[in-house]
């Protein structure tokens, strides 16, 4: 039996139905045979785990997804072994695998693969920061979102007015969330906003950074 | 040789109701899947039924489903087609055909006419 | 449900000549499409399967060609006994249609 599914990865927002299109051409007999189950991200594929099984005519679904798993067409005989997944969660993501057997046919695996992303907007991030907060030293705010799918990008921005920042003292890394100011000045002193951002929505968190003279140090 | 012979045909009122059968010989009906496929006069093909080996499953086109039902007995080596609430567009020849291991269909009968008519 | 298309309806050639007949799906069938042949009075007959594939007993000059939605059905030299209706047939999924034919007629 050969399987096709899509070559693309398929990504479905948190809470909604994810549909895994997978078709087949087979005369199908009485052997028929469907098993659709899942790997976790980064898990090989032969510690996979049974969702769902048809065979004799009746559907199986099993394991911890079975109450939110059922196919687009029961029976799969038609050609169509397409999954449907509903109220997708964080732990949906990984690789699902289609699998289609039916003696005699033999002539490929009937074994498709399908990434899915179950994508999640950014939690409330958390903001700290660290380092010397008096004229002259260095610090590092750092922001982090405990969720968020695809990963978050972060952008720090200062709050209200204030002179423009030489250049090199303030410098961000989107990807790991921090900024890092050096040489600071009392006008360094103010609200900071990380704002963390993915495809699905934006979360933010608040620092306010009080610069002392060298002798005292201080966040509030 | 692989032989399948229609049988069954004939004239029919409309809302009428007609079996046809097709016998095969030459190879191991039971594990074949088997379909019928009809043919209106001067028109081209359309499948109406399909049937795995061992009967468990039945497909049909919206055009005939509800209507038709396919069957089997593998002891006999004969493929069945029961059509009711038979219509005027009904009308034409029907062939048993053997479906490959994809479902093409490798091998035809000669056809059996329906006539649908009042 | 998919759509087949044929292209030309009928086709008028001589004996000797290269033949192409087109199909095409209303959507991607991969290489799942075959081809028939069909006398007038008789039934049809297998040529093409998987796009390519000739049974066995098949004359070479027919060949078959393409994948996803585009399909030709090529006779090389076309010879007395070819002249006949050829369909294309996608067996991707239910349900399995045909295309409405090619008429190959004498010149």
């Known amino acids: 039996v050969e399987v096709k599914v899509p070559t693309e990865p398929l990504s479905t927002p948190l809470g909604k139905t994810a549909e895994l299109t997978c078709t087949y051409s087979t005369s199908v007999g009485d052997s028929f045979a469907l098993e659709w189950s899942f790997v976790q991200p980064g898990k090989p594929i032969s510690e996979s785990h049974p969702i769902l099984y048809f065979t004799n005519g009746h559907l199986y679904p099993t394991g911890s997804k079975s109450k939110r798993v059922s196919l687009l067409q029961n029976p799969p005989t038609v050609g169509v072994a397409t999954l449907k997944l509903t109220d997708v969660h964080p732990s949906d993501t990984g690789t699902y695998l289609c699998q289609v057997n039916n003696p005699p046919d033999f002539y490929t695996n009937g074994l498709g693969l399908i990434n899915l992303t179950v994508l999640v907007p950014p939690s409330n991030p958390l903001c700290s920061q660290s380092g010397q907060t008096s004229v002259g030293g260095s610090t590092a705010l750092r922001c982090s979102s405990s969720e968020g799918a695809p990963k978050p990008v972060y952008n720090w921005v200062r709050l209200g007015t204030f002179p423009t920042p030489s250049p090199g003292s303030m410098v961000q890394d989107e990807v790991s969330g921090q900024l890092i100011l050096t040489n600071l000045s009392l006008t360094s002193s103010g609200t900071y906003r990380c704002v963390a951002t993915n495809q699905m929505g934006s979360a933010s968190c608040e620092l306010t950074l009080s610069v002392t003279e060298p002798s005292q140090g201080r966040v509030a | 040789e692989v032989q399948l012979v229609e049988s069954g045909g004939g004239l029919v009122k409309p809302g009428g109701s007609l079996r046809l059968s097709c016998a095969a010989s030459g190879f191991t009906f039971s594990n074949s899947g088997m379909s019928w496929v009809r043919q209106a006069p001067g028109k081209g093909l359309e499948w109406v039924a399909s049937i795995s080996d061992g009967g468990l499953y039945t497909h049909y086109p919206d055009s005939v489903k509800g209507r038709f039902t396919i069957s089997r007995d593998n002891a006999k080596s004969s493929l069945y087609l029961q059509m009711n609430s038979l219509r005027a567009e009904d009308t034409a020849v029907y062939y048993c055909?053997?479906?490959?291991?994809?479902?093409?269909?490798?091998?035809w009968g000669q056809g059996t006419l329906v006539t649908v008519s009042s | 449900d998919i759509q087949m298309t044929q292209s030309p309806s009928t086709l008028s050639a001589s004996v000797g000549d290269r033949v192409t007949i087109t199909c095409r799906a209303s959507e991607n069938i991969y290489s799942y499409l075959a081809w028939y042949q069909q006398k007038p009075g008789k039934s049809p007959k297998l040529l093409v399967f998987n796009a390519e594939t000739l049974p066995e007993g098949v004359p070479s000059r027919f060949s078959g060609s393409g994948s996803g939605t585009e399909f030709t059905l090529t006779i090389s030299s076309l010879q007395p006994d070819d002249f006949a209706t050829y369909y294309c047939?996608?067996?991707?999924?239910?349900?399995?249609?045909f295309g409405q034919g090619t008429k190959v007629e004498i010149k």
């Open positions: 047939q996608h067996h991707y999924v239910i349900p399995w249609t």
């Open positions: 055909a053997r479906q490959g291991v994809r479902p093409f269909f490798d091998y």
